[in-house]
């Protein structure tokens, strides 16, 4: 059976928030997967497709595992968007430096979804968004997405504010 | 607003079971680690464990590994600790905390062990 | 003006989080990653940290201050508390 080939894993940041796109590990390839979370520091994974691997060696690494599927090629619910946007703002608020991991399948649709909406939620232009993303992982969205993302309103609930109340564009280190 | 209501007040014999319970609301149960914590009478906090109730997975303090049991209903988002072989160093407030990093927490159950 | 201090055993980096404990047994966060102020918390609150050293400074005390504070790491498990502090009125 011919293997499929995984793109590698794709960091994106922006102000202060920072996530890893992945592919989909299987059993098999889960040490590796767990070393390459590591490696970028990942503390929290959001898996976005059908489960198709044990979490618990991931969890007993200290990563936190989120189980929110939503449909190949289509958009996420609402309920997954506001899980998503309140989960970013806490994460990063909370654990500064920390990165967020999403991964589909290949990482080319449902994952970089999420990603390209904190990016606009963050006060990126979708365009921008979608570009920017898109330099780091060619093929990234469908027309569908790409449509959703074009009329998706932001409510700009990750303009993140410093310690003494002021908007923050800049990054936290 | 983000809230946790915690079962009453429990008596207990020793060597018998607890289970107490910690309903969330005003969030996604399931985005957020639910933590327990103990507090003997005039004395510090103590972390038992967590549950992730997105995939079940817990975690225990050593301590009380063979002493609580964590689990979680999705649909009801309410978090469960059972106590086990309980004696009198049980008796304590136990709290549930979730929400980011103890963002919030229960106002607690009274675990009294007494024959 | 009072400040409780925490040290830290390892590098636990911003993770950690000052607690307040009232005489009913409420517990509400205060600051969380070491010097960020909780949403509704007054101004007089503030964290910050000096090597391994975290600090909790009330910098004008009100009678409803003194209570009882927890300082609790989240770098990693098992999370930790410290021993805790009763501020009492001298």
């Known amino acids: 059976m011919a293997r499929m080939n995984r793109p590698a894993p794709v960091e994106v940041t922006y102000k202060n928030m920072r996530f890893l796109i992945t592919h989909n590990p299987t059993n098999a390839t889960l040490n590796k997967f767990i070393e390459e979370l590591k490696k970028y520091g990942v503390t929290t994974i959001v898996r976005v497709c059908e489960a198709t691997y044990d979490t618990t060696l991931v969890e007993k690494e200290g990563i936190h595992v989120l189980d929110w599927p939503f449909d190949d090629g289509a958009p996420p619910s609402n309920q997954i968007v506001d899980d998503w946007l309140s989960l970013v703002k806490i994460k990063f608020r909370e654990e500064p430096g920390c990165c967020i991991a999403v991964h589909c399948v290949a990482g080319l649709g449902r994952a970089p979804v999420l990603v390209a909406l904190a990016l606009i939620e963050g006060g990126m232009k979708y365009e921008d968004a979608v570009q920017f993303i898109r330099q780091k992982r060619r093929g990234a969205f469908n027309s569908k997405q790409l449509l959703y993302l074009e009329k998706y309103r932001p409510k700009m609930r990750l303009r993140f504010k410093d310690s003494n109340g002021h908007r923050n564009n800049c990054c936290i280190q | 607003q983000v809230q946790f209501q915690q079962s009453g007040a429990e008596l207990a014999k020793p060597g018998a079971s607890v289970k107490m319970s910690c309903k969330a609301s005003?969030?996604?149960?399931?985005?957020?680690?639910m933590h327990w914590v103990k507090q003997r009478p005039g004395q510090g906090l103590e972390w038992i464990g967590y549950?992730?109730?997105?995939?079940?997975?817990?975690e225990y303090n050593q301590k009380f590994k063979d002493k609580a049991t964590l689990t979680a209903d999705k649909s009801s988002s309410t978090a469960y600790m059972q106590l086990s072989s309980l004696t009198s160093e049980d008796s304590a407030v136990y709290y549930c905390?979730?929400?980011?990093?103890?963002?919030?927490w229960g106002q607690g159950t009274t675990l009294t062990v007494s024959s | 003006r009072v400040s409780l201090t925490c040290r830290a055993s390892?590098?636990?980096?911003?993770?950690l989080n000052w607690l307040q404990q009232k005489a009913d047994g409420t517990i509400k966060r205060l600051i969380y990653?070491?010097?960020s102020l909780d949403s509704g918390v007054p101004k007089r609150f503030s964290g910050s940290r000096s090597g391994s050293d975290y600090s909790l400074t009330i910098s004008s005390l009100e009678s409803e201050d003194f209570v009882d504070y927890y300082c609790?790491?989240?770098?990693?498990?098992?999370?930790?508390f410290g021993g805790g502090t009763k501020l009492e009125i001298k």
């Open positions: 609790l790491q989240y770098a990693s498990s098992p999370w930790t």
């Open positions: 905390s979730s929400y980011g990093n103890f963002g919030y």
């Open positions: 990653a070491t010097s």
């Open positions: 549950i992730n109730p997105s995939t079940g997975y817990t």
């Open positions: 005003g969030y996604t149960f399931t985005s957020y680690r």
């Open positions: 390892q590098d636990i980096g911003s993770s």
